[in-house]
C-alpha cells in the first residue's frame, strides 16, 4: 500500500512539475525591465525565450518573436535546448510511468517489469528536473552578470549618436515557476525511484524443512514447491501428523506421499 501511494504521489508531483516546466518555457516573463528614461509614458519591458514584449501604461502591449533571428546568443539557445530536453524527457517519463503504476493493470504485466518501468520514469523525471533547474539558473546568471549589457555605453554611429539605455534587469515570474517546477519534477522522480524498490519482487528463498519424528531418528527433506505450499496428496484435508514441522517463516507445511519419516 505504501509503495502504491509513493508511486502515485511521485507520478502526480512529477506531472505538476512537468506542467510547470512547459508553462515556464512558454512564458514571456523570463526577465523584466523598467525603462526609466521614457519621457512619454511608463514603459514595462519583459522578454522570454521566444519573444520580447513592451507594455505601456495605457495597457497597449506589443510583442516581437525571435523566430526570424539567426544571430541569437548561444546562451539563450542553450537555455532553450535545456528546457526542451527537460520537457521531452518529462513527457516520455510520464508516458512510461502511466503503464508502470501499480493501480493500473495492463494484461499480465509482471511486477518486475513495472518496477523497471518505475525506475526508468523516475530517472527520466530526475534528469528532466535537473535540465529545467539548469536552464533557469543559466538564464538567471546571465541577468545577474548583466550578460546582455553592451560594453559601449555611448558612441557615434552612422546616423548620429547611439547610447545604451540603462535598464535594471530583474528576475521574471518564469524563473521562479521554472525553479519550483524543476524541483517538483526532481522530487517526483526520487519518489518513483523509491517506489521501484518496493515494487521489485524479492527472491523467494525456500529453506529446508526439518521434521521431528516422535522416535529417535530425524530426517531432513529439501523443501520444494509442494513442501512450501502444502500441496500434495492430502486433498481431502485429512488430519496428518506433522511432527511439529515449521518453516522459517512459521508457516505450517504438510508432508506429502513422497515424504518419508
Amino acid at each position: 500500500m505504501a509503495v502504491t501511494a509513493c508511486q502515485g504521489l511521485g507520478f502526480v508531483v512529477s506531472l505538476i512539475g512537468i506542467a510547470g516546466i512547459i508553462a515556464a518555457t512558454c512564458m514571456d516573463q523570463w526577465s523584466t525591465q523598467d525603462l526609466y528614461n521614457n519621457p512619454v509614458t511608463a514603459v514595462f519591458n519583459y522578454q522570454g525565450l521566444w519573444r520580447s514584449c513592451v507594455r505601456e501604461s495605457s495597457g497597449f502591449t506589443e510583442c516581437r518573436g525571435y523566430f526570424t533571428l539567426l544571430g541569437l546568443p548561444a546562451m539563450l539557445q542553450a537555455v532553450r535546448a535545456l528546457m526542451i530536453v527537460g520537457i521531452v524527457l518529462g513527457a516520455i517519463g510520464l508516458l512510461v510511468s502511466i503503464f508502470a503504476l501499480k493501480c493500473i493493470r495492463i494484461g499480465s504485466m509482471e511486477d518486475s517489469a513495472k518496477a523497471n518501468m518505475t525506475l526508468t520514469s523516475g530517472i527520466m523525471f530526475i534528469v528532466s528536473g535537473l535540465c529545467a533547474i539548469a536552464g533557469v539558473s543559466v538564464f538567471a546568471n546571465m541577468l545577474v552578470t548583466n550578460f546582455w549589457m553592451s560594453t559601449a555605453n555611448m558612441y557615434t554611429g552612422m546616423g548620429g549618436m547611439v547610447q545604451t539605455v540603462q535598464t535594471r534587469y530583474t528576475f521574471g515570474a518564469a524563473l521562479f515557476v521554472g525553479w519550483v517546477a524543476g524541483g517538483l519534477t526532481l522530487i517526483g522522480g526520487v519518489m518513483m525511484c523509491i517506489a521501484c524498490r518496493g515494487l521489485a519482487p524479492e527472491e523467494t528463498n525456500y529453506k529446508a524443512v526439518s521434521y521431528h519424528a516422535s522416535g529417535h531418528s530425524v530426517a531432513y527433506k529439501p523443501g520444494g514447491f509442494k513442501a512450501s505450499t502444502g500441496f500434495g496428496s492430502n486433498t481431502k484435508n485429512k488430519k496428518i501428523y506433522d511432527g511439529g514441522a515449521r518453516t522459517e517463516d512459521e508457516v505450517q507445511s504438510y508432508p506429502s506421499k513422497h515424504d518419508y519419516v
Epitope: 525603462l35 514603459v43 520580447s52 497597449f60 516581437r64 533571428l69 544571430g71 547611439v162 539605455v165
Partner: nanobody, 122 residues
Framework: AVQLVESGGGLVQAGGSLRLSCVAS????????MGWYRQAPGKQREWVTG???????RYADSVKGRFTISRDNAKNTVYLQMNSLKPEDTAVYYC????????????????WGQGTQVTVSA
C-alpha cells in the same frame, strides 16, 4: 547598423508650417518610443514631443496645441507637423528612438539622428 534620418527642415516665416519626418532603418528588431528633441544656438538640447508604439503622445508645454506628432509603425517613421511657428522655434531638430537591434534583442539602445535645421524668420 541602424540609422535615423530626418528630413523636412528649412526656412519658414513666422506663423507658417513645416512637416518633419524621420525614418529608422537598418537591423531593427523592436522600436519603442520615437520622438523629437531640439537644440537652439547656445542652448541645451530640450525634449519636444514623443510617441509610443501604442500611440500615446506627450508634448512639451512650449509646443502644446501647435505641434502634432504621428507615427507609421509599419514604416518605422515618425512625423512632426509644426503649425503656427514662432522665431523661438528656430533650432536643429533631432529625431530620437528607443529600439532593440537584431544583434542584441535583450538590450535597448537610444538612437539619435544627425538633425535637421528649422529656421523661423520674423
Amino acid at each position: 547598423a541602424v540609422q535615423l534620418v530626418e528630413s523636412g527642415g528649412g526656412l519658414v516665416q513666422a506663423g507658417g508650417s513645416l512637416r518633419l519626418s524621420c525614418v529608422a532603418s537598418g537591423s531593427i528588431f523592436q522600436i519603442n518610443t520615437m520622438g523629437w528633441y531640439r537644440q537652439a544656438p547656445g542652448k541645451q538640447r530640450e525634449w519636444v514631443t514623443g510617441i509610443t508604439t501604442g500611440g500615446t503622445t506627450r508634448y512639451a508645454d512650449s509646443v502644446k496645441g501647435r505641434f502634432t506628432i504621428s507615427r507609421d509603425n509599419a514604416k518605422n517613421t515618425v512625423y512632426l507637423q509644426m503649425n503656427s511657428l514662432k522665431p523661438e522655434d528656430t533650432a536643429v531638430y533631432y529625431c530620437n528612438s528607443d529600439l532593440k537591434t537584431t544583434s542584441n534583442v535583450f538590450q535597448w539602445y537610444e538612437y539619435w539622428g544627425q538633425g535637421t535645421q528649422v529656421t523661423v524668420s520674423a
